[in-house]
């Protein structure tokens, strides 16, 4: 799967390769199967959406988002406390302004709960990842894609 | 065996190519980011170039901006450094590093043994 | 970018003398400070994360300590092995990761 997403500027290089993995899933133990890539946009530093394909998994999986900031006054992990979903399956994180530290570093971690070994963690440049835009339709989000919050996430979890 | 190890290197003309090569084994490699450093003749470490997990985020040095490539193949457990318009001053060891999240905390738990580029005309 | 200055350089001691080597940021790093030993056509092998945790498997005797700017490696009985070249890399402003210039430890 190869999605192109806005190109914005700076040195870092930002198609959406998500790597899917052609091993079979019973050769490998949970714990090593690769995870999808989170893709993070700042759109007008209003919000941020930190998104990634949930249908790369072998089986649906609620997959958590946390992150940090490298920073003296606030390096506590944070979970996510909206998720996005894409058919009932977590697709992704948003933030919001509050949220949002352009020149800090921004940790992104991602983790099976089912298998906490099961994570991976990369950090980012924010600045590097600002889209300007007017208007978005439902369309350019990529169909049904909802806001939940990590309340909803726990009773839809367990539901 | 948990390891990593370079090959690729060699003598190369100033202007040349060379594309490294960076072998993983015994972690998952897919869900690690690996780094690129280097160490000059009887210099200091130097880091050249990061590459995030699944690939699509990378980050490059100033002094190789522009003339490293920095890719990885996590189907074969491979990271590769292609390496263009070489100069004198890339002479160095150059040593993959794989990194490591404790807490909020990220170091180079794993590195390779190196393998050795030289520039010279 | 950041920059990373040890202190000494160079330093000669003895088996068994307590031995500390500095580093210093051009800014303030919080506790993301790791150390690394480099044996001459080695490679590096990480000694300390987050400026005062012992890497699993290493010696008791290897600590580390500061946050903000300034920061300590101390060896508190110098064994025959632990001579080597030391660095200490900040991983804050990250990347770029920078490294101290190193501090060659040599036996007196």
């Known amino acids: 799967l190869n999605t192109t997403i806005l190109t914005p500027n700076g040195n870092e290089d930002t198609t959406a390769d998500f790597f899917l993995t052609t091993m079979p899933t019973d050769s490998l133990s949970v714990s090593t199967l690769p995870l999808p890539e989170v893709q993070c946009f700042v759109f007008n530093v209003e919000y941020m959406n930190c998104t990634w394909n949930s249908s790369s998994e072998p089986q649906p999986t609620n997959l958590t988002l946390h992150y940090w900031y490298k920073n003296s006054d606030n390096d506590k992990v944070q979970k996510c406390s909206h998720y996005l979903f894409s058919e009932e399956i977590t697709s992704g994180c948003q933030l919001q302004k509050k949220e949002i530290h352009l020149y800090q570093t921004f940790v992104v971690q991602l983790q099976d709960p089912r298998e906490p070994r099961r994570q991976a963690t990369q950090m980012l440049k924010l600045q590097n990842l600002v889209i300007e835009q007017k208007l978005i339709s439902e369309e350019d989000l990529g169909g049904e894609q909802k806001l939940i919050s990590e309340e909803d996430l726990h009773h839809h979890h367990h539901h | 065996q948990v390891q990593l190890v370079e090959s690729g290197g060699g003598v190369v003309k100033p202007g040349g190519s060379l594309r490294l090569s960076c072998a993983a084994s015994g972690f998952t490699f897919s869900n690690s980011g690996i780094h690129w450093v280097r160490q000059a003749p009887g210099k200091g470490l130097e880091w050249v170039a990061l590459?995030?997990?699944?690939?699509?985020?990378?980050y490059y040095a100033d002094s190789v901006k522009g003339r490293f490539t920095i890719s990885r193949d996590n189907s074969k457990n491979t990271l590769s450094l292609q390496m263009n318009s070489l100069r004198a001053e890339d002479t160095a060891v150059y040593y993959c590093?794989?990194?490591?999240?404790?807490?909020?905390?990220?170091?180079?738990?794993?590195w390779g043994r190196g393998t050795m580029v030289t520039v010279s005309s | 970018d950041i920059q990373m200055t040890q202190s000494p350089s160079s330093l000669s001691a003895s088996v068994g003398d307590r031995v500390t080597i500095t580093c210093r940021a051009s800014?303030?790093?919080?506790?993301?400070l790791n150390w690394y030993q480099q044996k001459p056509g080695k490679a590096p092998k990480l000694l300390i994360y987050?400026?005062?945790s012992l890497q699993s498997g290493v010696p008791s005797r290897f600590s580390g300590s500061g946050s903000g700017t300034d920061f300590t490696l101390t060896i508190s009985s110098l064994q025959p092995e632990d001579f080597a070249t030391y660095y200490c890399?900040?991983?804050?402003?990250?990347?770029?990761?920078?490294f101290g210039q190193g501090t060659r430890l040599e036996i007196k």
């Open positions: 590093a794989k990194e490591v999240w404790t807490g909020t905390y990220d170091s180079f738990d794993m």
């Open positions: 987050a400026a005062s």
């Open positions: 800014q303030s790093i919080s506790s993301y």
């Open positions: 890399q900040q991983s804050y402003s990250t990347p770029p990761i920078t």
């Open positions: 590459i995030s997990y699944a690939g699509s985020n990378k």
